[in-house]
């Protein structure tokens, strides 16, 4: 009863440092509460980017100071990460946990490589 999690392999952030991707999971049970965590893996370091727990049928809400926003629809979560800079380029992995009711299930995606390119500063114009 493995839980498969799918996410795109590559995403290019916008010039404003915003990247969006879908994290989809195949639920083996009838969960009413789901936790979605985005982890960033760079070199051998792992950092939690953001996490949200939501009730099925309700919106997922991240903490106010989170750099993530998202919406949910069935077994699909649309994630948006903002405020990204070139140094944030890396592999962003979606971890899904079916929290309630028991049994608990874990699913981890293969990761989305997000490329962030800092915009070139505008040249001074002489008028």
């Amino acid at each position: 009863k493995a839980m498969h999690v799918a996410q795109p392999a590559v995403v290019l952030a916008s010039s404003r440092g915003i990247a969006s991707f879908v994290c989809e999971y195949a639920s083996p049970g009838k969960a009413t509460e789901v936790r979605v965590t985005v982890l960033r893996q760079a070199d051998s370091q792992v950092t939690e980017v953001c996490a949200a727990t939501y009730m099925m049928g309700n919106e997922l809400t991240f903490l106010d100071d989170s750099i993530c926003t998202g919406t949910s629809s069935g077994n699909q979560v649309n994630l948006t990460i903002q405020g990204l800079r070139a140094m944030d380029t890396g592999l962003y992995i979606c971890k899904v946990e079916l929290m309630y009711p028991p049994p608990y299930y874990l699913g981890i995606g293969n990761g989305t490589q997000i490329y962030v390119i800092d915009p070139e500063p505008c040249p001074d114009s002489d008028f």
């Epitope: 009863k1 493995a2 839980m3 083996p28 509460e33 936790r35 982890l39 792992v46 939690e48 996490a51 727990t53 971890k95 929290m99 309630y100 028991p102 049994p103 608990y104 299930y105 874990l106 699913g107 981890i108």
Partner: antibody
Framework: QVQLVESGGGVVQPGRSLRLSCAAS????????MNWVRQAPGKGLEWVAV????????HYADSVKGRFTISRDNSKNTLYLQMNSLRAEDTAVYYC????????????WGQGTLVTVSS | EIVLTQSPGTLSLSPGERATLSCRAS?????LAWYQQKPGQAPRLLIY???SRATGIPDRFSGSGSGTDFTLTISRLEPEDFAVYYC?????????FGQGTKVEIK
């Protein structure tokens, strides 16, 4: 560095109660699922219970369901295990263990506290 | 619940030899971890996700496998590697451990 220190073990009679504590330090306690794992003398490891993040969700092994209650105080970075209606077969070293970044394996363990249920 | 069966129960080897420990699941397992435990000590995480080494674990320890068959390999046994090794599945609750394999000095 991550540190987990259990306390509260001891000798108790069958049918009585005991509360274990686990003081955590060196990490953001509320970001992790926390577990109790036990080991009877000379035996293998048995997962007992988990409590998630904010403390609302808890799961238990069938062997302790209805008798043991796991709880946490994130303001005190402390994990608890309330053990009621203790039986001789609950005799074990009880370990507090942190869940990992990538799921509920156990990446850090306390030193353990021995609970002996005997008349 | 998923039952994990480890084999052999005891492995008698000499320092410098290669150790191969097996963990077989009663049904397909998504996520598996390996632990080492020495007498009087708490277990120590070696491997998670079937093949990822935990922080500070020497590269002589490696994990492999998927589905129902998993292996922990110690390429060259050091004196400090003689201990009991446990596998654990954590893809779905209840999380279960194998009964352990004791690696002893021959």
């Amino acid at each position: 560095q991550v540190q987990l220190v259990e306390s509260g073990g001891g000798v108790v009679q069958p049918g009585r109660s005991l509360r274990l504590s686990c003081a955590a330090s060196g990490f953001t306690f509320s970001n992790y699922g926390m577990n109790w794992v036990r080991q009877a003398p000379g035996k293998g490891l048995e997962w007992v219970a988990v409590i998630w993040y904010d403390g609302r969700n808890k799961h238990y092994a069938d062997s302790v369901k209805g008798r043991f209650t796991i709880s946490r105080d994130n303001s005190k970075n402390t994990l608890y295990l309330q053990m009621n209606s203790l039986r001789a077969e609950d005799t074990a070293v009880y370990y507090c263990a942190r869940g990992g970044d990538w799921g509920p394996y156990f990446d850090y363990w306390g030193q353990g506290t021995l609970v002996t249920v005997s008349s | 619940e998923i039952v994990l069966t480890q084999s052999p129960g005891t492995l008698s080897l000499s320092p410098g030899e290669r150790a191969t420990l097996s963990c077989r699941a009663s049904q397909s397992v998504s996520y598996l971890a390996w632990y080492q435990q020495k007498p009087g000590q708490a277990p120590r995480l070696l491997i998670y996700g079937a093949s990822s080494r935990a922080t500070g674990i020497p590269d002589r320890f490696s994990g492999s496998g998927s589905g129902t068959d998993f292996t922990l390999t110690i390429s060259r046994l050091e004196p400090e590697d003689f201990a009991v090794y446990y596998c654990q599945q954590y893809g779905s609750s209840p999380w279960t451990f194998g009964q352990g394999t004791k690696v002893e000095i021959k």
